[in-house]
Interface confidence: medium
């Protein structure tokens, strides 16, 4: 479907892109000599970045630190020192620069202070870092402050002493609205949620906690839960996980009323060892790893239903290091509905899986066109494309990026990857997908830097290489043809692409530092591809495009969760600008209802390749209890159950019974009389 | 097809530096793969010595730690061992061995399964 | 580190017998166990890895299975080519350790 990747032969060249491109390279050098810089974007097409740059020596006694605070209001073209605006305080880099959601502006800095004060320091702006006003603190921080997802003026945060504070107007006065704090979140409608230890300590009383909420800022508290591990929001579910009475081992409670009520996940229970992992969750469900027994590396990933309470197997043997560890669970979020992971094969290899289907079936990714199967393959004609994720970068193989997908570049994904039976340690190649994952093509040779310009317009690379660079790659037909840039004459140790979040803008910035033989000197190089994308994208540009179409014949092509897509997409020769302002128009049709659009109910699992849902051998015969709302309940199902988002209709509908005993659940987690108010007066 | 080939003397002075080379031919080292240093004394049993990776990351026997380097030359296609202070108890057979292609998930991150070895070079240690 | 302990020493086993080889690992490697065969002044050959699977271009002759523990190498009918010293070795954790070997005669 699409050739191999050609850099510079037998592509198109664009017309005058050096002179074009050199107009726009804009040089920035940063006079410290600091050892480490980080780069926060404040608001969404401000073009106002802070660059906060560290430099720190480990003295006998005490480290000795200095900060110094940059600020761009041209997406990094240009820099101005407001190192002042701080009282050029050091900041402290562990707590990064806290940036407000949306377009609030706001800003704060953590500082560091002497080891006698009362508490900590913190600079806030409202401005985008324009202005910067101290504050000293009552506490000692022991977070990054937290915006309110529905308030920016609204903070909490926790004190080294673990105490939480809430602060209803930015960080100028602060109020300790509870004492013994372990975890705290906010929720949807500036609820918090957080746990508390009733004894010794938050590591000690694990697994006895208590889960408190707020409603109004830490006026008044209700108890929601008791003997509780450990709490998390994915989507519109909180969940806990719970104690058992019995023995150590613990399970997930799930609520959807904020903690009024629970219902027990039908989920296995996990051992001390053990631990849950919510993957990724939205407004319809849930992803959830599950452990496995043992130091493994592996669970299984399960998915939910509309209640988050009935869940069915999804992938087996679903690569999760440890507790907090690593796994390399993508949301592809350039094409609803798909996702890769990695799987730990039975000779402890690792295979990728993608599904498009949000998780109702997993498949290999398909061998990209033209390649070949490398070493680890048994049969050198048979074989798929393995993904390189978080796992291969925490093992310091040699993959500078994670896999990447914009939800306005729709259909691509970009990764590093090798070809064969498993992963390879070989150095990996770059391979794009431009249908969302079902067919791949080797887009760079080697590893590389990568990041999507102008809703997919443009893409960018840099090699990956531990000499100094100086050339930057690009392509405007999604991978296929490729440009090199010379953008400076003196190369740099290059440490880093940066370009706004959200693939709108057209400025990429190359970080990195020269080198001499006692000084670092940190630079940026902006370069700005307006030029290049020199007219904006008409009708004409643009063609529509069929999501996960896999067979054009087949009415029911296109299909995914009940409804198929149809996008405008930019036609690969076309050279124009999307624009930031560009929206990805689509065409959605309702679908009938077929196998497809149900997952297995709870007892049941889909073999490999197949589509009918089979009983779980292990509960074959059993009646099947499950906890609904503080009821015991026995479910009787025919092994489906519609996937949630599923929007098909008509067709085939399978009907599930549920019979109500009315028995009570045994958790006391679940216990009425143990959810009580209180005010805190 | 790839090989790989031991070089170095045969024999090494008491309390001197054992150094090795393994060349390889038919595949380039900085493409990938482990490539690992065994050794076996006369009629005993192996003992992995250490692996590197193309890279250059390392990865030792506890036990020969405190006296062992691997490098990797990847311009000369080639890897090296050096062993220093060695006793007549280092004398033994040393093969060179390419480690899996595979990305094996384990506690130790790196895992070594060599597929393919080179022929051995004996090494003796003796004054 | 795991000490990979093997048995018998020494097999002895006419040609066309099956001869079964055993290798035990001082704490679990899951399935990360490879074995291996050498022939008096050869190199050693990877036979078997991932507790059960051949490696290209070994005879189905040769399987493999256990694991955590305990595993197994199974010659199902020994050919004259087989005579030679079996290693096991696992690869779940630095240091890498191999078994002490046996050796399988003919009787």
């Known amino acids: 479907r699409r050739g191999a990747p050609a850099e510079d032969q037998d592509c198109g060249r664009l017309p005058d892109f050096i002179a074009k491109l050199t107009n726009n390279t804009h040089q920035h050098v940063f006079d410290d000599l600091s050892g480490s810089v980080s780069l926060s974007w404040v608001g969404d097409s401000t073009g106002v970045i802070l660059v906060l740059t560290t430099f720190q020596v480990p003295l006998v006694i005490v480290s000795f630190g200095q900060s110094k605070l940059y600020r761009s209001e041209d997406y990094g073209k240009n820099f101005k020192d407001i190192t002042n605006l701080i009282n050029n305080t050091f900041i402290r880099t562990e707590f990064g620069m806290a940036i407000g959601p949306e377009n609030s502006g706001k800003v704060i800095l953590t500082a560091e202070v002497s080891g006698g004060s009362r508490g900590g320091r913190v600079f806030r702006s409202s401005d985008f870092a324009k202005n910067f006003v101290q504050t000293d603190l009552p506490f000692h921080p022991l977070t990054q402050m937290m915006y309110s997802p529905q308030n920016s003026d609204y903070l909490l945060a926790l004190s080294t002493e673990n105490g939480l504070w809430v602060s209803k107007n930015f960080g100028e006065k602060w109020e300790e609205i509870h004492k013994a704090v372990c975890l705290a979140k906010w929720g949807p409608n500036n609820i918090i949620f957080f746990t508390t230890h009733v004894n010794g300590s938050c590591k000690a009383d694990l697994g006895a906690l208590e889960l408190w909420r707020t409603s109004d800022l830490g006026k008044t508290f209700k108890t929601i839960g008791v003997k509780i591990y450990s709490f998390g929001l994915g989507g519109r579910f909180l969940f806990a996980s719970v104690m058992a009475d019995k023995d150590t081992t613990r399970r997930i409670h799930v609520s959807t009323d904020q903690g009024d009520t629970w219902s027990m996940a039908q989920l296995p229970s996990v051992g001390q060892e053990q631990f849950y992992s919510i993957l990724a969750a939205n407004e319809d469900m849930v992803f959830m790893h599950v452990d496995e027994p043992g130091d493994t590396g592996f669970g299984t990933i399960f998915t939910s239903d509309d209640r988050g309470i009935v869940y069915s197997k999804s992938l087996d043997r679903h690569l999760y290091t440890t507790t907090g560890g690593e796994t390399d669970f993508t949301n592809v979020t350039s094409l609803r509905g798909v996702y890769i992971t990695s799987t730990l094969s039975e000779d402890n290899s690792i295979q990728s899986m993608i599904t498009f289907d949000q998780g109702g079936r997993w498949e290999h990714l398909r061998k990209p066109e033209n390649s070949k199967c490398d070493a680890t393959a048994k049969n050198k004609n048979e074989c798929s494309l393995h993904i390189h994720a978080s796992y291969s970068i925490s093992q310091k193989l040699n993959v500078p990026m994670a896999p990447l997908s914009e939800p306005n570049a729709v259909g691509i994904v970009i990764a590093h990857g090798s070809v064969g039976d498993a992963i390879s340690v070989m150095v990996p190649d770059v391979y794009i997908s431009d249908d969302g994952g079902y067919s791949w093509a080797k887009m760079l040779e080697g590893p590389h830097y990568y990041t999507i310009l102008d809703s997919g317009g443009i893409i960018v690379a840099i090699e990956h290489s531990n000499r100094p660079i100086n050339v930057i790659k690009f392509s405007t037909d999604e991978g296929q043809c490729w440009q090199s840039y010379v953008f400076t004459q003196e190369p740099i140790y290059f440490t880093g692409l940066a370009s706004e979040p959200g693939a709108r803008s057209m400025n990429i910035s190359i970080w990195g530092f020269t080198e001499s033989f006692i000084t670092r000197q940190w630079v940026s190089y902006t370069v700005d591809f307006k030029d290049i994308l020199e007219r904006n994208c008409e009708e004409d540009d643009y063609t529509t495009w069929l999501a996960h179409s896999t067979d054009p014949g087949d009415y029911k092509d296109g299909c995914i969760l009940g409804y198929k897509e149809q996008f405008l997409r930019l036609r690969k020769s076309s050279v124009c600008q999307n624009g930031r302002d560009y929206v990805v128009a689509k065409q959605p049709s309702v679908c009938p209802c077929s196998l497809e659009d149900f997952l297995c109910d709870f007892g049941y699992f889909r073999p490999e390749n197949a589509s009918e849902c089979v009983e779980q051998p292990e509960l074959k015969g059993h009646e099947l209890e499950f906890c609904l709302y503080g009821k015991e309940e026995h479910l009787t199902t025919n092994g489906y159950r519609k996937i949630p988002g599923d929007k098909c209709q008509g067709g085939m509908n399978p009907a599930r019974e549920v019979k109500d005993l009315k028995k009570k659940c045994t958790s006391n987690f679940l216990n009425p009389t143990k959810q009580n108010s209180k005010s805190n007066s | 097809q790839v090989q790989l080939q031991e070089s170095g003397p045969g024999l090494v002075k008491p309390s001197e530096t054992l150094s090795l080379t393994c060349a390889v031919s038919?595949?380039?080292?900085?493409?990938?793969?482990?490539w690992g240093w065994i050794r076996q004394p006369p009629g005993k049993g192996l003992e992995w010595i250490g692996s590197?990776?193309?890279?250059?990351?390392?990865y030792y026997n506890p036990s020969l730690k405190s006296r062992v380097t691997i490098s990797v030359d990847t311009s000369k296609n080639q890897f090296s061992l050096k062993l220093s202070s060695v006793t007549a108890a280092d004398t033994a057979v040393y093969y060179c061995a390419r480690g899996s292609p595979r990305f094996y998930y384990g506690s130790g991150s790196y895992l070594d399964l060599f597929d393919i070895w080179g022929q051995g070079t004996m090494v003796t240690v003796s004054s | 580190e795991i000490v990979m302990t093997q048995s018998p020493a020494t097999l002895s086993v006419s040609p066309g017998e099956r001869a079964t080889l055993s290798c035990r690992a001082s704490q679990s490697v899951s399935s990360n166990l490879a074995w291996y065969q050498q022939k008096p002044g050869q190199a050693p050959r990877l036979l078997i890895y991932g507790a059960s699977t051949r490696a290209t271009g070994i005879p189905a002759r040769f399987s493999g299975s256990g694991s955590g523990t305990e595993f197994t190498l199974t010659i199902s009918s020994l050919q004259s080519e087989d005579f030679a010293v079996y290693y096991c070795?696992?690869?779940?954790?630095?240091?890498?350790?191999f078994g002490g070997g046996t050796k399988v005669e003919i009787k």
């Open positions: 590197i990776y193309h890279s250059g990351s390392t």
């Open positions: 070795q696992e690869y779940l954790n630095y240091p890498i350790t």
């Open positions: 038919g595949y380039s080292i900085s493409s990938g793969y482990y």
